[in-house]
């Protein structure tokens, strides 16, 4: 079994490992999230994503988590267990992103653009919160991201 984000295949990443890393810090992260009325990875970001669109969307989302979320949170936490879990998630996200090569062909532009508009909905919601709250919420929503990604884990 492997991830199939449309035409983009990802080998060597097992969802179970991602879930185990997240579960180790889930309660801590979600308990720290004080803004329960808002959601970053809202339904409209992830629903009805076509297979072709999924490669672009997962690429932009994981890159954002790597460059903005994990990177900034790493500088803010000293708790060893938390750091270890997020290192596991980050390393696996790097492995996934390194294998994703979304098509840059012109005929794919409408699919690519739609994926970027979905991503912007997420990023704008993230940027509206203060940094600490946004990071905590994004980390607490990794389960939403993993649940969506798991749909693309196929034989």
């Amino acid at each position: 079994q492997e991830f199939h984000f449309g035409p983009c295949q990802v080998k060597g990443v097992v969802p179970q490992k991602l879930w185990e890393a997240f579960w180790a810090v889930k309660d801590t992260m979600q308990a720290q999230d004080n803004i329960t009325s808002a959601r970053l990875l809202q339904q409209e970001v992830l629903q009805n994503v076509s297979d072709a669109e999924s490669c672009y969307l997962v690429h932009t989302l994981l890159e954002f988590y790597l460059k903005t979320v994990f990177k900034n949170y790493h500088n803010r936490t000293v708790e060893v267990r938390t750091l270890k879990s997020f290192s596991t998630l980050a390393n696996n996200f790097v492995l996934i992103v390194s294998q994703l090569q979304p098509s840059q062909e012109n005929e794919m532009f409408s699919i690519r653009d739609s994926a970027h508009r979905r991503f912007l909905l997420f990023r704008r919601a993230f940027k509206q919160l203060d940094v600490e709250a946004a990071l905590t919420k994004a980390l607490g929503e990794v389960d939403i991201l993993l649940t969506w990604m798991q749909k693309f884990y196929k034989l």
């Epitope: 409209e44 970027h116 912007l120 909905l121 990023r123 704008r124 919601a125 940027k127 509206q128």
Partner: antibody, heavy 118, light 109 residues
Framework: EVQLQESGPGLVKPSQTLSLTCTVS??????????WSWIRQPPGKGLEWMGV???????YYSPSLKSRTSISRDTSKNQFSLQLSSVTPEDTAVYYC??????????WGQGTQVTVSS | QAVVTQEPSLSVSPGGTVTLTCGLS?????????PGWFQQTPGQAPRTLIY???SRHSGVPSRFSGSISGNKAALTITGAQPEDEADYYC?????????FGGGTKLTVL
């Protein structure tokens, strides 16, 4: 191809609320993942982004106008609207509505002139 | 609020090449700012040329191209035409809002 048409009063008195509507034809405002923006241009000056309503109905505004701006939509009429409160003569401008490509406007209305004067 | 900077004016000879740039007061412009470029002639609504750094809007001639050059977004017009004389604006996404540059007046002479 999508077309946009702004409408509303051309003259607004200071301290009142400016209300404009953008009617969209050639496609539903709820189809796809598009966002819908308002931009204005004071006479002889550059473009100023005012705000956007995303396809899920969430709204985002320019920090400098946030306290006075509200964008909403009426999906049954295929329209979205701008309200700008407590206007002053500095709000005199051509107001444009647009459908975003990605992040920035793609298709523009032809614009409507709004003058703030007593 | 972030400030987006553009050259106030530039000129180009017909058939020549010109590059307009778009900078950000708070640092480098990246593809994550989704740079857009717009053309406006007097009395007309703006027209979108480029979005998402380098994607040409429908119907835009191939002589217009967008890129990131150094720490700025860039619009290059290759083989400028007299009808390209206009004001050009860039726009950058700054997270939860968008900011336009002050515009560049391009003269074709």
């Amino acid at each position: 191809e999508v077309q946009l048409q702004e409408s509303g009063p051309g003259l607004v008195k200071p301290s009142q609320t400016l209300s404009l509507t953008c009617t969209v034809s050639g496609g539903s405002i709820t189809t796809g993942t598009y966002s819908w923006s308002w931009i204005r241009q004071p006479p002889g000056k550059g473009l100023e982004w005012m705000g956007v309503i995303a396809y899920d109905g969430s709204t985002y505004y320019s920090p400098s106008l946030k306290s006075r701006t509200s964008i909403s939509r009426d999906t049954s009429k295929n329209q979205f609207s701008l309200q700008l409160s407590s206007v002053t003569p500095e709000d005199t401008a051509v107001y444009y509505c647009a459908r975003d490509d990605v992040a920035a406007p793609g298709y523009w209305g032809q614009g409507t002139q709004v003058t703030v004067s007593s | 609020q972030a400030v987006v900077t553009q050259e106030p004016s530039l000129s180009v000879s017909p058939g020549g090449t010109v590059t307009l740039t778009c900078g950000l007061s708070s640092g480098s412009v990246t593809t994550g700012n989704y740079p857009g470029w717009f053309q406006q002639t007097p009395g007309q609504a703006p027209r979108t040329l480029i979005y998402s750094t380098s994607s040409r809007h429908s119907g835009v001639p191939s002589r217009f191209s967008g890129s990131i050059s150094g720490n700025k977004a860039a619009l290059t017009i290759t083989g400028a035409q007299p009808e390209d004389e206009a004001d050009y604006y860039c726009a950058l996404d700054i997270g939860s809002y968008v900011v336009f540059g002050g515009g560049t007046k391009l003269t074709v002479l």
